[in-house]
């Protein structure tokens, strides 16, 4: 039975040209995390494999940095980066947990962090 929950940074906003940390945290389970995949819509941005470390998509290697932890840092943001991001936690024995973050990249300096929320 899957007992864990994923806490994410929720709905967030950031300024064009700036950077943002996408963060998920898996709690309430003793399952072993084997791999975390970070996806933007249907595109794979990065993988963090428990044994073999971080792997970044060649399309994003100049703008994506691994961490902190299992999170992902997006740099040199553009308005095209606005959209949904998913952290997919592959675990044993539980299976797969998915967290969702919505990022809005703003032209002006009115960017604020949204509230944190949980996805079971």
């Amino acid at each position: 039975m899957m007992t864990g929950t994923i806490e994410t940074t929720g709905n967030i906003s950031a300024e064009k040209g700036g950077s943002i940390i996408l963060q998920c945290h898996l709690s309430s389970t003793t399952a072993q995390v084997t791999q975390v995949n970070w996806e933007q819509q249907d595109q794979l941005l990065a993988i963090c494999n428990a044994d073999l470390g971080w792997h970044i998509s060649p399309s994003f290697k100049d703008r994506v940095a691994p961490g902190p932890g299992l999170g992902l840092t997006l740099q040199s943001l553009t308005v095209n980066d606005t959209g949904e991001y998913f952290c997919i936690y592959h675990t044993y024995p539980d299976g797969t947990y998915t967290g969702r973050i919505f990022l809005e990249v703003l032209e002006s300096s009115v960017a604020e962090h949204g509230a944190r929320f949980q996805i079971p």
Epitope: T34, H55, S57, K61, H90, T96
Partner: antibody, heavy 117, light 106 residues
Framework: EVQLQQSGPELQRPGASVKLSCKAS????????IYWLKQRPKQSLEIIGR????????YFVDKFKNRATLTTNTSSNTAYMQLSSLTSEDTAIYFC??????????WGQGVMVTASS | NIHLTQSPSLLSASVGDRVTLSCKGS??????LVWYQQKLGEAPKLLIY???NLQSGIPSRFSGSGSGTDYTLTISSLQPEDAATYFC????????FGSGTKLEIK
């Protein structure tokens, strides 16, 4: 043209060590991780580990953590794998491969290692 | 980690045939699937990445398809030089390879 040139075949006694080399050319050596993989007849390819030539950081699957050593020489664009305490189970073809993001795009030609008395 | 099963393990076909090779995952592979060709005594060569993208320089008779757990490599018109072993590889959960399909020319 990207190329990975591996050293020649090895015959070693059980219990001995072997050191294999993989010379890279045709790209910037420090920009891609090098993986080492093992292939035995009628079995799936198996990952041994990874090294980042940029900083020398290594990663291993559990099975090889205590027996494999990965190093690089960035001045000669060469990666090395040393495998110790050889047994007959280590008789296999070993490949080095470059990873581009999430998959291996160029491979060495492979080197046959035989552990036999 | 995901286990990949390839079928058949051995396939014999004639020049000009349309050939289909299968790769099935023990879990969802999420289209993060790659196909390699390995000729006897040679290194594997990248054919298809991300399920259906043809690697540069690979003939257009090779194509890939699939989703979820089930993936296919198709050779539309088999050529003599296609005799080889074909491996699938996934990176959705762990980095694992199938055990291969050996393709022989009749």
């Amino acid at each position: 043209e990207v190329q990975l040139q591996q050293s020649g075949p090895e015959l070693q006694r059980p219990g001995a060590s072997v050191k294999l080399s993989c010379k890279a050319s045709g790209y910037t050596f420090t920009e891609h991780s090098i993986y080492w993989l093992k292939q035995r007849p009628k079995q799936s390819l198996e990952i041994i580990g990874r090294i980042d030539p940029k900083n020398g950081r290594t990663y291993f699957v559990d099975k090889f953590k205590n027996r494999a050593t990965l190093t690089t020489n960035t001045s000669s664009n060469t990666a090395y794998m040393q495998l110790s305490s050889l047994t007959s189970e280590d008789t296999a073809i070993y490949f080095c491969a470059r990873i581009d993001g999430f998959y291996f795009d160029f491979w060495g030609q492979g080197v046959m290692v035989t552990a036999s008395s | 980690n995901i286990h990949l099963t390839q079928s058949p393990s051995l396939l014999s076909a004639s020049v000009g045939d349309r050939v289909t090779l299968s790769c099935k995952g023990s879990q969802n592979v999420n289209k993060y699937l790659v196909w390699y060709q390995q000729k006897l005594g040679e290194a594997p060569k990248l054919l298809i990445y991300s399920t259906d993208n043809l690697q540069s320089g690979i003939p257009s008779r090779f194509s890939g398809s699939g989703s979820g757990t089930d993936y296919t490599l198709t050779i539309s018109s088999l050529q003599p030089e296609d005799a080889a072993t074909y491996f699938c590889y996934q990176y959705n959960n762990g980095f694992t390879f199938g055990s291969g399909t050996k393709l022989e020319i009749k």
